[in-house]
Amino acid sequence: QGWQAFKNDATEIIPELGEYPEPPPELENNKTMNRAENGGRPPHHPFETKDVSEYSCRELHFTRYVTDGPCRSAKPVTELVCSGQCGPARLLPNAIGRGKWWRPSGPDFRCIPDRYRAQRVQLLCPGGEAPRARKVRLVASCKCKRLTRFHNQSELKDFGTEAARPQKGRKPRPRARSAKANQAELENAY
C-alpha cells in the first residue's frame, strides 16, 4: 500500500510517494504556464499510425504549493499534468485552445504519467511551528499508452523507477528547535 493521492483544501492534487494519481480533469486555481510539449516523440504519418511511439500528448506545466496538515511549502513546486487525448504527433495543437483534437476511431490511447521525480520541500507552519521536510512525487514526463479492454486503472499507474534525481547538493536540513524554541515535523499512516 503506497502513499495516497491527497486532495487538499485548495483543490490541488498532491501526489504522495508510491502512488500515481490521474491528472486532475481541469486546472482550476493552478497557474499554468500553457506550455505544450510532445514528450520528444517524433511526428509521423498522421492517419496510418499503429505504434504507440508515434502518438503524443500534452505535458502541461503548472505550479502549486504543497500542503501538509496546517502547513504549506515555502516555495511552489512545478510539475506536469498529462493532458488530453493522444493522437498522431503532427496533429496535436501546439498550445491550449489552438487546433482541433484528432479523435481516434481505433484503439484508445491514453495520456498518462511516464516518469516521476521526488522533490524535498520545506513546509512552513502557522503558530510558530518551525519548518518540516516532506518529499513529494511529481510527474516528470507523460506518455501515450494504448488501452485495451483488458487494461484497468492500476495498469496505468506505471512506477517511475528512473525518475529524475533532485539536485545532489546538500540541502539545508530542518534543525530541531529546542524545547523552548520549537521546531518539528509530522504527517500520514496504516
Partner: antibody, heavy 118, light 107 residues
C-alpha cells in the same frame, strides 16, 4: 506493495558494534526519509533518528549522537543503522521505518532483535 | 525532551465498546501528533497523523482529536482485531517522543 525487510537477530558483547540492515521495496529509497526506532523488552518506543538517502542528510536524537550512524545504499534500496559502544541497555528490537516526511513513520520493518550480553 | 503521557496505561473492554485513550504533551505540540497500533511481536502501524487525519486504509471507527497539549484517540466500536497497544507520538520538536502506550485488553 511497500515492504521493509530487516536483517536477522544479533547477539553482541558490551563495547561492540552492531549494524542492522533494512531492504526497502515498492519504491526507491531515495524518494523517502528513513527512520530508526527501537523498543526495549516490555517497554515503549524510542525514536533514534532519520536520514534522507537522496542527499545523505541525517538527524539523530541527542541521546544517540556519536554512537549511531545511519546510511543507505540507494543502488540496492537498503538502509543501515550502526550502533557502537553497545551496553546492556541497548538490548532491544530495532525497527526501520519509512515515510514521505521527517516527522512520522508510515511503513515499518518487522524489527531486528539485538541482545547485548557478556 | 517533550514528555507524552498516555492514560490509561491499560484498559479492559468488550467488542462493541467505545474506547477513548488520551495523551498529554508536556508542552504545546500544536497538532503534530500521530497514533500507532502495535500487536504483540509485530511492528507498529500508523493509524492517525496530524492529530485527526486517518492514514490510508484505517477503518473509520478510529478517530483522533486535539491540539496543543491534549489529544485523544477514540475507537467508536471496538472490534476483535483492535485489541493491541496504542502509542501516541509527537512530531513537533526533536527528539520525537512517544507515549508509554495503552494496552487494550479483552474484558
Amino acid at each position: 506493495q511497500v515492504q521493509l525487510v530487516q536483517s536477522g537477530a544479533e547477539v553482541k558483547k558490551p563495547g561492540a558494534s552492531v549494524k542492522v540492515s533494512c531492504k526497502v521495496s515498492g519504491f526507491p529509497i531515495k524518494d523517502t526519509f528513513q527512520h530508526w526506532v527501537r523498543q526495549a523488552p516490555g517497554k515503549g518506543l524510542e525514536w533514534m533518528g532519520w536520514s534522507d538517502p537522496e542527499i545523505g542528510d541525517t538527524e539523530y536524537a541527542s541521546k544517540f549522537q556519536g554512537r549511531v550512524t545511519m546510511t543507505e545504499d540507494t543502488s540496492t534500496d537498503t538502509a543501515y543503522m550502526e550502533l557502537s559502544s553497545l551496553r546492556s541497555e541497548d538490548t532491544a528490537v530495532y525497527y526501520c521505518a519509512t515515510g514521505d516526511t521527517t516527522y512520522k513513520f508510515d511503513f515499518w520493518g518487522q524489527g531486528t532483535t539485538v541482545t547485548v550480553s557478556s | 525532551d517533550i514528555q507524552m503521557t498516555q492514560s490509561p496505561s491499560s484498559l479492559s473492554a468488550s467488542v462493541g465498546d467505545r474506547v477513548t485513550i488520551t495523551c498529554k504533551a508536556s508542552q504545546d505540540v500544536h497538532t503534530a501528533v500521530a497514533w500507532y497500533q502495535q500487536k504483540p511481536g509485530k511492528a507498529p502501524k500508523l493509524l492517525i497523523y496530524w492529530a485527526s487525519t486517518r492514514w490510508t486504509g484505517v477503518p473509520s471507527r478510529f478517530s483522533g482529536s486535539g491540539s496543543g497539549t491534549d489529544f485523544t484517540l477514540t475507537i467508536s466500536s471496538l472490534q476483535p482485531e483492535d485489541f493491541a497497544t496504542y502509542y501516541c507520538q509527537q512530531g513537533d520538536t526533536l527528539p520525537y517522543t512517544f507515549g508509554g502506550g495503552t494496552k487494550v485488553e479483552i474484558k
